[in-house]
């Protein structure tokens, strides 16, 4: 019998500010590049070490941006995304969501070691 | 590839006034940061003034004395040092770093001192007030 992978979805709001390198971060996606199939959302692709978004410690790579400073990026071209980004000023305000993949057992089995529940 | 190389140290006396170049090549100076930092015999390496395209940042220890600029066709930063003084003496540095940011911007803000934040150094420039 097969682990069953299951995903842990959380949605969080970071506020980084602007520093020598920026917010320390890269982004793709958009509706012109979807990076995730089906999903035209803006994703973390990349976190710069020492910027300011590994110093704050909550951003991932793979985090799913949803909105900046209260704008909504669904449905935006890349570039759209990136002018958004642009215009939000010395302090960021990020909504996002994490998705942690969580690893079941196969049903019905208890793993030693593991809570009783 | 990036690289920064710094000018103008030397000796001068009290009193007496340097200006420091800081030539940068492999990317255009007008949207990265540039920083200078400063470290004398035995001490650890100081933050002096941090300048981008849209703020400029000086030490308490040289405000109304140095003054940081940038020219942009020449892709060099200056810092104008003005009334030195013997504990000015140090080896001066420049630095900048690496822009990771969904728009490409980047400014000093107000940690810009964090030697960790920069990427890149020059050689250094020795300066002596003596």
């Known amino acids: 019998m097969n682990g069953r992978v299951d995903y842990l979805v959380t949605e969080e709001e970071i506020n980084l500010t602007r520093g020598p390198s920026g917010l320390g971060f890269n982004i793709v996606g958009g509706t012109d590049q979807q990076y995730v199939s089906n999903d035209s959302g803006i994703y973390v692709s990349r976190i710069k070490e020492n910027g300011a978004a590994a110093l704050d410690g909550r951003l991932q790579e793979g985090d799913k941006i949803l909105s900046v400073n209260g704008q909504d990026l669904k449905n935006l071209l890349h570039q759209d995304a990136v002018d958004l980004f642009r215009n939000a000023g010395y302090a960021v305000s990020l909504r996002v969501q994490h998705r942690l993949q969580v690893q079941n057992g196969p049903i019905g089995h208890r793993g030693e070691g593991d809570p009783s529940g | 590839e990036v690289q920064l190389v710094e000018s103008g140290g030397g000796l001068v006396q009290p009193g007496g006034s340097l200006r420091l170049s800081c030539a940068a090549s492999?990317?255009?100076?007008?949207?990265?940061?540039i920083s200078w930092f400063r470290q004398a015999p035995g001490k650890e390496r100081e933050g002096v003034s941090c300048i981008s395209s849209s703020d400029t940042y000086y030490a308490d220890s040289v405000k109304g004395r140095f003054t940081i600029s940038r020219d942009n066709a020449k892709n060099t930063v200056y810092l104008q040092m003005n009334s030195l003084k013997p504990e000015d003496t140090a080896v001066y540095y420049c630095a900048t770093a690496a822009i990771w940011d969904p728009s490409g911007l980047a400014v000093c803000g107000s940690s810009w001192y964090r030697r960790g934040w920069w990427d890149y150094w020059g050689q250094g420039t020795q300066v002596t007030v003596s």
């Open positions: 492999g990317f255009t100076s007008d949207y990265y940061v």
